[in-house]
Amino acid sequence: ATKLTEEKYELKEGQTLDVKCDYTLEKFASSQKAWQIIRDGEMPKTLACTERPSKNSHPVQVGRIILEDYHDHGLLRVRMVNLQVEDSGLYQCVIYQPPKEPHMLFDRIRLVVTKGFSGTPGSNENSTQNVYKIPPTTTKALCPLYTSPRTVTQAPPKSTADVSTPDSEINLTNVTDIIRVPVFN
């Protein structure tokens, strides 16, 4: 069984999710990479991807998602700006490696976006919510469509664990087919 871990981010509407996915530099530097959402009972859906081949430090923006692939650091940076409640969900980074199936990067991100002010909870209710105006699209990359001989028919179980501290991880075990990820646009 593959052991999957998640890190949970609890943010307010209007804030930015800013995360990284590490990858093996020598192996995947120029490979095309994607940011996916995994909804219960559905296969992962690609929301944005880098160009092919992936360009170093070249921002790709698709709506409110900005991807930057730092080849020299071996990391993909993902930002989701001006978060909305509907953005809540489970996300992952994958690397496209045709003709093989996408390679999933750990750890997954469990994003929880709540309504309310982006000031510290308990602070003055007059604090200003950060509604950041998104600049024009930088580059919009086309993401490939993959088909797979084995499909994931069910997303990993939604953990009921209470994850409140930054260091907590949700460990998902007995998940066998997760590495095979067909991608839909």
Epitope: K12, T16, K20, D22, L25, S57, Y70, G119, K133, P166
Partner: antibody, heavy 121, light 105 residues
């Protein structure tokens, strides 16, 4: 609990090199970036670079490129920062710090106690 | 290179509210952290993700962000809050602001 313990104070001559260590405990060493930050007397905090203990890859601030080397020994969960061609401007307290999470580069939630490096002829 | 701008100093009377700002290009797209640094001690994270307090940080510390300016607010400031405060963000590299010396009169 997470702890970062640094090596002791150093006195070096101009032109020499210094190697500061940072021993990590209380967590999986490979899982989190280690950063090095310094503060010179009367100056602010200055980020020097990060080390990915898993891959051994490092990213250095432009100011220190070619003069700093960050390495690690995973068998003893220790990160190292070596700074060469020292000048008096390198006199500072050097800190190692750990990322709060595996999936972020900032913030730095855990810090070493600091190592004072004095460069003097 | 990316820069974060802070006022060099801020003064406040005990019990009053202190506000320290940090501004930078496209800061609205980045998460801001704040650190407290006292002489002879290691930095302490007081705010992360713009407005979250780590455990152990008093409730009088709060953070907010509007557009490209982040603000650290200390309400009911105490003498023990006198320190240097630094904002931080991640551009291509990690960047600290120049620091603000908070004096409690």
């Amino acid at each position: 609990q997470v702890q970062l313990v640094q090596s002791g104070a150093e006195v070096k001559k101009p032109g020499a090199s210094v190697k500061v260590s940072c021993k990590a405990s209380g967590y999986t060493f490979n899982g989190y970036y280690i950063h090095w930050v310094r503060q010179a007397p009367g100056q602010g905090l200055e980020w020097m670079g990060w080390l990915n203990p898993n891959s051994g890859g490092a990213n250095y601030a432009q100011k220190f490129q070619g003069r700093v080397t960050m390495t690690r020994d995973t068998s003893i969960s220790t990160a190292y920062m070596e700074l060469s061609r020292l000048t008096s401007d390198d006199t500072a307290v050097y800190y190692c710090a750990r990322d709060q999470r595996k999936t972020t580069v900032t913030p730095f939630e855990y810090w070493g106690q600091g190592t004072l490096v004095t460069v003097s002829s | 290179s990316y820069e974060l701008t802070q006022p060099p100093s801020v003064s406040v009377s005990p019990g009053q509210t202190a506000s320290i700002t940090c501004s930078g290009d496209k800061l609205g797209e980045r998460q801001v952290s704040w650190y407290q640094l006292k002489p002879g001690q290691s930095p302490v994270l007081v705010i992360y993700q713009d407005n979250k307090r780590p455990s152990g940080i008093p409730e009088r510390f709060s953070g907010s962000k509007s557009g490209n300016t982040a603000t650290l607010t200390i309400s009911g400031t105490q003498a023990m809050d006198e320190a240097d405060y630094y904002c931080q963000a991640w551009d291509r590299n990690v960047v600290f602001g120049g620091g603000t010396k908070l004096t409690v009169l």
